[in-house]
């Protein structure tokens, strides 16, 4: 999505703010930041690798290269999510992670990338010939999906050595463009600073009318919630076929959060509120999120051994005490 930043009009500096270098200096960094963040088209990446240590284990890693905040990630196999693919895991930045066998461990790697370990039964299993897809619902970009599969020669001995995730990869043109804008901005800021140095600063009048502007907080799960999202263990299905429908979910819509794999000590944010909300197979990510939040506090219809139930209707966060975010 190529979006152009709306650059606010630079107003003449107010007399009372001249000592603080006026609006111009304060506005410019934000304008530059907006230009940098909104430049370029989002890209989604998927990497599928067979673990050299365990021949039956696959690692799927996905990431979103865009400016928006991720609101939901869906990992599926057998094709794209809305077209015959079977959901393996759903990751929400705040509400936690849900996964189905044969997914073994889904987790956030960064705010915009995830990884999923999949348990198979060797290279000859159906997994070795399967397409894995990741769909990122992000605001404001919308939904973006990419798919990947194992290379034809999936012998771990022959495969390329593991390389760092392409999270920080960007096109040279993009880097140069952003660098140029930033360099120009820095030079301009230095010019303003120098000009300000040579100008005698008038006395600052304390402003009675303008309260201190609240500091904007960027979207990002905290370190604690990031750690809480990591699911340590899940049901392992040694065959690479999807589990039967009574334990997993039909193609159209999974039996949501019915047997949430969770670790009581490790996952304070495990969502009981997510227990049995049906998700539309298609539709915008807004409707998906609305569906997830619709039945907050409802008890799941059947619970597996791994499910931690939170009796408080407000969900798990109500039990967190002083550390919980209300």
């Amino acid at each position: 999505m190529r979006t152009e930043a709306q650059v606010p009009a630079l107003q003449p500096p107010e007399p009372g703010l001249e000592g603080a270098m006026g609006h111009r200096t304060l506005v410019l960094p934000w304008v530059l930041l907006t230009l940098c963040v909104t430049a370029g088209t989002p890209e989604v990446w998927v990497q599928v690798r067979m673990e050299a240590t365990e021949l039956s284990s696959f690692t799927i890693r996905c990431g979103f290269l865009g400016s928006g905040s991720i609101s939901l990630v869906t990992v599926s196999w057998g094709g794209p999510n809305g077209a015959g693919g079977t959901t393996l895991a759903v990751l929400h930045p705040e509400r936690g992670i849900r996964q189905w066998a044969p997914a073994r461990q889904a987790r956030w790697e960064t705010q915009s990338s995830i990884s999923l370990i999949l348990e198979g039964s060797g290279a000859s299993s159906p997994c070795a010939n399967t397409t894995f897809c990741c769909k990122f619902a992000s605001f404001p970009e919308g939904s973006w999906e990419a798919c990947g599969s194992l290379p034809p020669s999936s012998d771990p001995g022959l495969s390329a050595p593991p390389t760092p995730a392409p999270i920080l990869r960007a096109d040279l043109a993009g880097i140069l463009g952003v660098s140029g804008v930033l360099l120009f901005g820095c030079v301009y800021l230095l010019h303003l600073l120098r000009r300000h140095k040579h100008r005698p600063a008038p006395r600052l009048q304390p402003s009675r009318t303008s309260p201190q502007a609240p500091r904007a907080r960027a979207w990002a799960p905290s370190q604690a919630s990031q750690a809480a999202l990591h699911v340590p263990y899940a049901t392992i299905n040694t065959s690479c076929r999807p589990a039967t429908l009574d334990t997993a979910h039909p193609h159209g819509g999974p039996s949501w959060w019915a047997s949430l794999p969770t670790h009581a000590a490790h996952r304070p944010q495990g969502p009981a509120a997510w227990a049995s909300t049906p998700i539309p197979a298609r539709g915008s990510f807004v409707s998906v999120e609305n569906g997830l939040y619709a039945q907050a506090g409802e008890r799941p219809p059947h619970t597996g051994p791994g499910l931690t139930l939170f009796p408080d209707p407000r969900g798990p966060r109500a039990m967190e005490g002083p550390l919980g975010v209300r």
Epitope: T41, E43, V44, W45, V46, Q47, V48, R49, W144, E145, A146, C147, G148, L150, P151, S159, A160, P162, T163, P166, D171
Partner: nanobody, 127 residues
Framework: QVQLVESGGGLVQAGGSLRLSCVAS????????MAWFRQAPGKEREFVAY???????????SYADFVKGRFTAFRDNTRNTMYLQMNRLRPEDTAVYYC?????????????????WGQGTQVTVSS
């Protein structure tokens, strides 16, 4: 040169789905980026989606604004076929869809960046 053959087009009702295929033959190993373009009658050819890949088996995908999560471009693990899964089709998606391949690496949105083209497959979405 890479030879590309598209298939999977046809007539579909609005809201329906289609999956287009593009089979590559020839010097397929030299193609690093494959894309879908479309051309509606009386309009210019426009970028729909691309998929590109790297040596560490990482697949990337990017899409045009109008796709808005409805289409998914991907390839199978034999690396010889690329697909365009089209969901929630609209009448304005009616066009001839072309598969294209570029032999150099990059994030390409312009038709001029691609040096191999298929003959196209017609997609008609009726309201």
């Amino acid at each position: 040169q890479v030879q590309l053959v598209e298939s999977g087009g046809g007539l579909v009702q609005a809201g329906g789905s289609l999956r287009l295929s593009c089979v590559a033959s020839g010097r397929t190993f030299s193609a690093n980026t494959m894309a879908w373009f479309r051309q509606a009658p009386g309009k210019e050819r426009e970028f729909v989606a691309y998929t590109r890949w790297t040596d560490d088996n990482t697949d990337y995908a990017s899409y045009a604004d109008f796709v808005k999560g409805r289409f998914t471009a991907f390839r199978d693990n034999t690396r010889n076929t690329m697909y365009l899964q089209m969901n929630r089709l609209r009448p304005e998606d009616t066009a001839v869809y072309y598969c294209a391949a570029a032999t150099t690496r990059g994030t390409y949105y312009s038709a001029g960046d691609y040096n191999s083209w298929g003959q196209g497959t017609q997609v008609t979405v009726s309201s």
